[in-house]
């Protein structure tokens, strides 16, 4: 039985869609296309007679169409206009002929997307960020991807708009990353590029390490300490250091040489992070004694947390 | 107190390459980052990169990356800013500035600055 | 990379007047601003960071105010020493960019 299949079925506008014929009877000696589901001469795009492998152009010819010697019909530079049936009429010897319809179906070129977004920089636990893939087309399914994966389950994304907005609620320090829409229809897909979210967050209560040179578990008279503190922060935070409610200096490490029971008292890191608005700090009581028997860094830390 | 204090002026060759010397004191030389900051004639500052003592890592300008070079000598408490295939528009006054703090600070003490002069 | 612009690019003022500089930067800074001050032959002196923090040193008729991406240095009452270059920079992160400059001269 003849056929018609349509390569491909789904065409993008401007693309080339090929209409083949499958089960062409043995005696044939021409063959007419024509728009839509019947014979009719108002709808002739082209007629070809095998014999002299000639085509003739019909009233409904555009310009676009080519017709093959297997009775295969191309049709180039697709417009939605060609959405529809396909008739072919093979004529036979015998004057008995067929007809097979196909049909396509074109879709609008998509545009590149991009994405517009309220807020690139969010502050952790407090902003939520909305981004919007932008244009809007009618018939296409929109999809997103973080890191280049297809988007994580959580209650705090939520997909509106006909998944146009993707918001996230009450952003965390983990959801900062590469975000892309990507636009399909049954034709074709097109992703945006790249937008960037830099969530900051911070500054974590910090931590302070102690490094004894020469290393010992104990604070002895006539060692340098050296107090690293730490804090998770983004923006990395602003260091400073108070001994004994005394400001000192604005670095990471506090370093004292050949400390002596002078020296004794609380160690205050603060951090500072002005983009968050956050502060956080830690206090260790540090003794020194002149003996071994030295009790060291005192472990119960206090944590003081402003916002 | 802190002092930072620089080579000498230098009168080069375009084409040529200058190697300035910050000589750090009066702190812990392996706790603040050095800066390498340039003002050309009757301009403005403009910032070349910075190096941690502490580990050698360095961060630079995107307009001087593949022509400049920083490092240090732990030992003399020195850091070294090196300007390579000068041009006549790197003539300027070279300053080492140390960074307040660590992290996010501005620059709080400056070098006495460098002459370099490029010139055929 | 963040754009510094300062203005006005140069002022003359008399002794006791309020002076004004402003800088805009291109990017929100969060408030990681600082002011220098560089008088004739001299190098740059740091005067205030983190927008308005003061500089142990630094008297106090010079003030800081701003915030996101606009900035102001004040001097409230200009006196003679005060005759220099005032630079904005942005501390937040490398590279570390400054404004072109506002020179400052007495009437």
């Known amino acids: 039985k003849l056929t018609i299949e349509s390569t491909p079925f789904n065409v993008a506008e401007g693309k080339e869609v090929l209409l083949l014929a499958h089960n062409l009877p043995q005696n044939r000696i021409g063959y007419s296309w024509y728009k839509g589901e019947r014979v009719d001469g108002n709808s002739l795009i082209v007629g070809y007679v095998i014999g002299t492998q000639q085509a003739t152009p019909g009233p409904a010819y555009s310009g676009r169409e080519t017709i093959y010697p297997n009775a295969s019909l191309l049709i180039q530079n697709v417009t939605q206009n060609d959405t529809g049936f396909y008739t072919l009429q093979v004529i036979k010897s015998d004057l008995v002929n067929e007809e097979a319809t196909g049909q396509f179906h074109v879709y609008p070129e998509l545009p590149k997307p991009s994405i517009s977004s309220n807020n690139s920089n969010p502050v952790e636990d407090k902003d939520a960020v909305a981004f919007t893939c932008e244009p809007e087309v009618q018939n296409t399914t929109y999809l997103w991807w973080v890191n280049g994966q297809s988007l994580p389950v959580s209650p705090r994304l939520q997909l509106s708009n006909g998944n146009m907005t993707l918001t996230l609620l009450s952003v965390k320090r983990n959801d900062a990353g590469s975000y892309e829409c990507e636009i399909q229809n049954p034709a074709s897909a097109n992703r945006s590029d790249p937008v960037t979210l830099n969530v900051l967050y911070g500054p974590d209560v910090p931590t302070i390490s102690p490094i004894i040179s020469p290393p010992d578990s104990s604070y002895l008279s006539g060692a340098n300490l050296n107090l690293s503190c730490h804090s998770a922060s983004n923006p990395s935070p602003q260091y400073s250091w108070r001994i004994n409610g005394i400001p000192q200096q604005h670095t990471q490490v506090l370093f004292i040489a050949k400390i002596t029971p002078n020296n004794n008292g609380t160690y205050a890191c603060f951090v500072s992070n002005l983009a968050t608005g956050r502060n956080n700090s830690i206090v260790k009581s540090i003794t020194v004694s002149a003996s071994g028997t030295s009790p060291g860094l005192s472990a119960g830390a206090h944590h003081h947390h402003h916002h | 107190q802190v002092q930072l204090v620089q080579s000498g002026a230098e009168v080069k060759k375009p084409g040529a390459s200058v190697k300035v010397s910050c000589k750090a004191s009066g702190y812990i030389f392996t706790s603040y980052w050095l800066h390498w900051v340039r003002q050309a004639p009757g301009q403005g500052l403009e910032w070349i990169g910075y190096i941690n003592p502490q580990t050698g890592y360095t961060s630079y300008a995107q307009k001087f990356q593949g022509r400049v070079t920083m490092t240090r000598d732990t030992s003399t408490s020195t850091v070294y800013m090196e300007l390579s295939s000068l041009r006549s528009e790197d003539t300027a006054v070279y300053y080492c500035a140390r960074e307040y703090g660590n992290y996010n600070y501005p620059l709080d003490y400056w070098g006495q600055g460098t002459l370099v002069t490029v010139s055929s | 990379d963040i754009q510094m612009t300062q203005s006005p690019s140069s002022l003359s003022a008399s002794v006791g007047d309020r002076v004004t500089i402003t800088c805009r930067a291109s990017?929100?800074?969060?408030?990681?601003l600082a002011w220098y001050q560089q008088k004739p032959g001299k190098v740059p002196k740091l005067l205030i960071y983190?927008?308005?923090n003061l500089v142990e040193g630094v008297p106090s008729r010079f003030s800081g105010s701003g915030s996101g991406t606009d900035f102001t240095l004040t001097i409230s009452s200009l006196q003679p020493e005060d005759v220099a270059t005032y630079y904005c920079q942005h501390h937040l992160g490398t590279p570390y960019t400054f404004g072109q400059g506002t020179k400052v001269e007495i009437k």
């Open positions: 983190n927008t308005k």
């Open positions: 990017e929100n800074q969060y408030g990681y």
